[in-house]
Interface confidence: medium
């Protein structure tokens, strides 16, 4: 089977059940339902999934049975619309149920919430978790899928199955270990961090498809796959791009069964054709399906073919440039992007896309000019400033990171971004700036040749988080502008923002800066978040505060927390010393 099946199926639900197997079918339906109805209790979802699974089995037995010919959207949508508390729990989302497919599914998609009002996941004691795991392994793992899926409504479903497999393996191994906690906790931390990163990366793919269209996603995929598979022919890369686009379009559209099935087919195709794709796939292709697909997605770049000719010959010097462009614009631009990307694993994908856009704009202008060749002869010179801008930015920020360390680097970014877009909510500014700050430890350790693809493509993922969170409750025209004008220029757009001079400082509220003894029992990370929240609020109160003023206040704050956490009567200390700290801070900042 190729990724595009042309064989007709009487029953789509039976077809997917047979392709995926019962276990994966149930897991994917649970993920789909939890991503749509994010507030529903676990037990309600399990009941719905069991009903769908039983129905699927009747269709496997007899594809002509009643309703088996219905589309998956119709079947799943009908099932979701049976939820009794839909109106009370989800408000206007209940109106989706009055619509017909495909409008009903589009309506459900529009109501996915990137920041659902759900309690933070608290990790129970290791013994409690191990008991729950042993008592009912199936329910324990389903609960994991449910909790992740409802908090991350765009999580890449087939990849979530891979995470669940690792989650199960961690418990299977560690619940038998002598020191369960020492074995389990680092594994769970790793899964949590990787899961958040995976969710954010997929969110960017979905935003790319949904906000900027298939062409934008395909351009991204051509660039990335050409970097990864520089020995593959252009036609091969194009085929992979088409198939990958289909997979991600399906997952982003809530078609998780089709997506998982097509992703498996794509992995199969890649492994069957690895000789013409990449020499780095051998190990990946020996793994079981979920591991194989994950491995292929993360595989290192293959070596560039030796003696690749100069790009200028075909794309600048050739007399056929305008003719080839006119013949098939997107193919010619695709070839340009492919040829440029395979030669530049040292560039970020977004930079490659900026170069391709510049090239396209130049050809559009020049191929209608009196002397096209003279007009576009210097097009590669226009690339120089585009390449140097991220190089310089990364150099400066890595120097700052090495000087300050991660926490203080995050603080510098918090101040920078709060001054740029002070209207954005404090939790969003803290979350985004903390993640932006992680670029330092993630990428600055790399040699020059790997820094830009690591840093700028990571920043694209993080800034997309800002964009999707801001879209839910838009408060800043500047954020909206940077988020919507151009996908590939988001980072330069935010970088170019200066202090927002139109911002009216927030009224001072002592309550914002009142702390209690509970801060002492927080983890180091949570304590940092408290301090960073205070820092953002300070900047919102006094946007013109200097670095030195802010540093002095933050140092006093750190000393105050340390002092009161050592005090015998912590609560009294926080109350009395807190008042003094607020007064001193107001004086220091001239509030």
């Amino acid at each position: 089977r190729g990724v595009f099946r042309r064989d007709a199926h009487k029953s789509e639900v039976a077809h997917r059940f047979k392709d995926l197997g019962e276990e994966n079918f149930k897991a994917l339906v649970l993920i789909a339902f939890a991503q749509y109805l994010q507030q529903c209790p676990f037990e309600d979802h399990v009941k719905l999934v069991n009903e769908v699974t039983e129905f699927a089995k009747t269709c496997v037995a007899d594809e002509s049975a009643e309703n088996c010919d219905k589309s998956l959207h119709t079947l799943f949508g009908d099932k979701l619309c049976t939820v009794a508390t839909l109106r009370e729990t989800y408000g206007e989302m209940a109106d989706c149920c009055a619509k017909q497919e495909p409008e009903r599914n589009e309506c459900f998609l529009q109501h996915k919430d990137d920041n659902p009002n759900l309690p933070r996941l608290v990790r129970p004691e290791v013994d409690v978790m191990c008991t729950a795991f042993h008592d009912n392994e199936e329910t324990f793992l389903k609960k994991y899928l449910y909790e992740i899926a409802r908090r991350h409504p765009y999580f890449y479903a087939p990849e979530l199955l891979f995470f669940a497999k690792r989650y199960k393996a961690a418990f299977t191994e560690c619940c038998q270990a002598a020191d369960k906690a020492a074995c389990l906790l680092p594994k769970l931390d790793e899964l949590r961090d990787e899961g958040k990163a995976s969710s954010a990366k997929q969110r960017l793919k979905c935003a790319s498809l949904q906000k900027f269209g298939e062409r934008a996603f395909k351009a991204w995929a051509v660039a990335r796959l050409s970097q990864r598979f520089p020995k593959a022919e252009f036609a091969e890369v194009s085929k992979l791009v088409t198939d990958l686009t289909k997979v991600h379009t399906e997952c982003c559209h809530g078609d998780l069964l089709e997506c998982a099935d097509d992703r498996a087919d794509l992995a199969k195709y890649i492994c069957e054709n690895q000789d013409s794709i990449s020499s780095k796939l051998k190990e990946c292709c020996e793994k079981p399906l979920l591991e194989k697909s994950h491995c292929i997605a993360e595989v290192e770049n293959d070596e560039m073919p030796a003696d690749l000719p100069s790009l200028a010959a075909d794309f600048v010097e050739s007399k056929d440039v305008c003719k080839n462009y006119a013949e098939a614009k997107d193919v010619f631009l695709g070839m340009f992007l492919y040829e440029y990307a395979r030669r530049h694993p040292d560039y970020s994908v977004v930079l490659l896309l900026r170069l391709a856009k510049t090239y396209e704009t130049t050809l559009e202008k020049c191929c209608a000019a009196a002397d096209p060749h003279e007009c576009y002869a210097k097009v590669f010179d226009e690339f120089k400033p585009l390449v140097e801008e991220p190089q310089n930015l990364i150099k400066q920020n890595c120097e700052l990171f090495e000087q300050l360390g991660e926490y203080k680097f995050q603080n510098a970014l918090l101040v920078r971004y709060t001054k740029k877009v002070p209207q954005v909510s404090t939790p969003t500014l803290v979350e985004v700036s903390r993640n932006l700050g992680k670029v330092g430890s993630k990428c600055c350790k790399h040699p020059e040749a790997k820094r830009m693809p690591c840093a700028e493509d990571y920043l694209s993922v993080v800034l997309n988080q800002l964009c999707v969170l801001h879209e839910k409750t838009p408060v800043s025209d500047r954020v909206t502008k940077c988020c919507t004008e151009s996908l590939v220029n988001r980072r330069p757009c935010f970088s170019a923002l200066e202090v927002d001079e139109t911002y009216v400082p927030k009224e001072f509220n002592a309550e914002t800066f009142t702390f209690h003894a509970d801060i002492c029992t927080l983890s180091e990370k949570e304590r940092q978040i408290k301090k960073q929240t205070a820092l953002v609020e300070l900047v919102k109160h006094k946007p013109k505060a200097t670095k030195e003023q802010l540093k002095a206040v933050m140092d006093d704050f750190a000393a105050f927390v340390e002092k009161c956490c050592k005090a015998d009567d912590k609560e009294t200390c926080f109350a009395e010393e807190g008042k003094k700290l607020v007064a001193a801070s107001q004086a220091a900042l001239g509030l």
């Epitope: 085929k239 007399k319 003719k323 006119a326 013949e327 098939a328 614009k329 997107d330």
Partner: antibody, heavy 119, light 111 residues
Framework: EVQLVQSGAEVKKPGESLKISCKGS????????IGWVRQMPGKGLEWMGI????????RYSPSFEGQVTISADKSISTAYLQWSSLKASDTAMYYC????????????WGQGTLVTVSS | QSALTQPASVSGSPGQSITISCSGI?????????VSWYQQYPGKAPKLIIY???KRPSGVSNRFSGSKSGNTASLTISGLQADDEAEYSC???????????FGGGTQLTVL
């Protein structure tokens, strides 16, 4: 306004030569490919070949290679389709089309030239 | 013999929807959505109604829509009207340095 105007209908005998024309106006003639399409009586459309008037690069469909010649004179914004020796099976309606962006997309068409070859 | 395959004829009643398929699209044409559809009335020049698989030129009714799955493209006409009765042909890019190809054409009859 973009227009493609083709020369009038022709009645010829087998073995004779013929050159029909397609004049473009209202756009930059040298920046777009021109395609020629044959439609035999009661049959479907067939792409015969394409030409880029900017440099006269010409490509033919395999079944028309050596059977016809496509040319262009950019100074008068005109493309041509010619036969050196007509056959009865060349009887058909011939259309020219401006190809926008990709060769499979003819966005403006001539009105057609009917060629009849009969002894 | 065309490289693209279409049904010779389809028919439908006014108000109904019909779909015409076009199989044999090359993978490169598929990757870049290089498929067009033309409408032709007897004795008239073809008219572009869909390009790049799904796009409609301005002035073309939104009753006409295009889609693609794998190596098959489809043209759907909804709310069929008497003046939709015509020949419909698909055309696809045949690869760099090659000439495009047409499908054999499909005669639509409105009953």
């Amino acid at each position: 306004e973009v227009q493609l105007v083709q020369s009038g209908a022709e009645v010829k005998k087998p073995g004779e030569s013929l050159k029909i024309s397609c004049k473009g106006s209202g756009y930059s003639f040298t920046s777009y490919w021109i395609g020629w399409v044959r439609q035999m009586p009661g049959k479907g459309l067939e792409w015969m070949g394409i030409i880029y008037p900017g440099d006269s690069d010409t490509r033919y469909s395999p079944s028309f290679e050596g059977q016809v010649t496509i040319s262009a004179d950019k100074s008068i914004s005109t493309a041509y389709l010619q036969w050196s020796s007509l056959k009865a099976s060349d009887t058909a309606m011939y259309y020219c089309a401006r190809l926008h962006g990709v060769v499979s997309r003819g966005d403006y068409w001539g009105q057609g030239t009917l060629v009849t070859v009969s002894s | 013999q065309s490289a693209l395959t279409q049904p010779a004829s389809v028919s439908g009643s006014p108000g109904q929807s019909i779909t015409i398929s076009c199989s044999g699209i090359s993978s490169l044409a598929g990757s870049y959505n290089l498929v067009s559809w033309y409408q032709q009335y007897p004795g008239k020049a073809p008219k572009l109604i869909i390009y790049e698989v799904t796009k409609r030129p301005s002035g073309v009714s939104n009753r006409f829509s295009g889609s693609k799955s794998g190596n098959t493209a489809s043209l759907t006409i909804s709310g069929l009207q008497a003046d939709d009765e015509a020949e419909y042909s698909c055309s696809s890019y045949a690869g760099r340095n090659a000439v495009a190809v047409f499908g054999g054409g499909t005669q639509l009859t409105v009953l």
